[in-house]
Interface confidence: low
């Protein structure tokens, strides 16, 4: 019969014949022959291959380097790579999460619109009229000014985006 020029899915062409690819989690030891099937071996500890393949070496699991602020989010298997994320208070610098940076803090006058996650930084927003923030924080939202009226007090000093209003007693001399 004519030697094949193309092979089925999960096969590869070598020496004019179709051999089975190794399944995910295994590497190629030897190609098939006219008489033998492809020989595959499982990947070792801390190695993986995530596709049907003819690789002679498995890939090393990614190392989540604590010196770069990384920790393991999901341990790798023989078929999947390790997934890294950042330590508390840090977020990934890229989708691949190869290193981390400290979460940004929102300065006084700004509040946290969205708290940072392992993959995204803090989002800050200016405190609108009626709200304030007097701290630099990665968690604090803008707080509403104190309502003097509900305490039967009057505003003695107006609030700003960085300071609360100052309440004081009612002027008793008014008719």
């Amino acid at each position: 019969p004519e030697p094949p020029t193309a092979c089925r899915e999960k096969q590869y062409l070598i020496n004019s014949q179709c051999c089975s690819l190794c399944q995910p989690g295994q590497k190629l030891v030897s190609d098939c022959t006219e008489f033998t099937e492809t020989e595959c071996l499982p990947c070792g500890e801390s190695e993986f291959l995530d596709t049907w393949n003819r690789e002679t070496h498995c890939h090393q699991h990614k190392y989540c380097d604590p010196n770069l602020g990384l920790r393991v989010q999901q341990k790798g298997t023989s078929e999947t790579d390790t997934i890294c994320t950042c330590e508390e208070g840090w977020h990934c610098t890229s989708e691949a999460c190869e290193s981390c940076v400290l979460h940004r803090s929102c300065s006084p006058g700004f509040g946290v619109k969205q708290i940072a996650t392992g993959v995204s930084d803090t989002i800050c927003e200016p405190c609108p009229v009626g709200f304030f923030s007097n701290v630099s924080s990665a968690f604090e939202k803008c707080h509403p000014w104190t309502s003097c009226e509900t305490k039967d007090l009057v505003v003695q000093q107006a609030g700003t985006n960085k300071t609360d209003v100052v309440c004081g007693p009612q002027d008793r001399l008014r008719a």
Epitope: Q60, K62, Y63, D65, N67, S94, E98, S99
Partner: nanobody, 120 residues
């Protein structure tokens, strides 16, 4: 064994400038990131800035706009230009090169550190 040699640490006035450099004693292949860390008196070590193999640079908020990181890839040299120095920048600055060794193992080289003191 590759050595990282740091230089440029000194006593500087507040508002002054310094340039730190870190050079590897041999070429390191498969560098993933080069970074400067610092450890101030009584403080934990923190990453100041790092630059990935794709030349993307990241800075800690405390140094953004004041410090600039650059590198010479061929020589595995990384520089930290420090401007508008503040007393709180006082620390031992350590160079770090994060790389993938043969066999795909990710490893680090660390320098011994260079002292930066900001004081009037």
């Amino acid at each position: 064994e590759v050595q990282l040699v740091e230089s440029g640490g000194a006593l500087a006035q507040p508002g002054g400038s310094l340039r730190l450099s870190c050079e590897a004693s041999a070429t390191i292949r498969s560098v993933n990131a080069m970074a400067w860390y610092r450890q101030g008196p009584g403080k934990p070590r923190e990453m100041v800035a790092n630059i990935t193999s794709g030349d993307t640079t990241y800075y800690a908020d405390s140094v953004k706009g004041r410090f600039t990181l650059s590198r010479e890839g061929a020589r595995n040299t990384v520089y930290l230009q420090m401007n508008s120095l503040k007393p709180e920048d006082t620390a031992v600055y350590q160079c770090n090169i994060h790389y993938t060794s043969t066999g795909g193992i990710r490893r680090d080289y660390w320098g011994r550190g260079t002292q930066v003191t900001v004081s009037s």
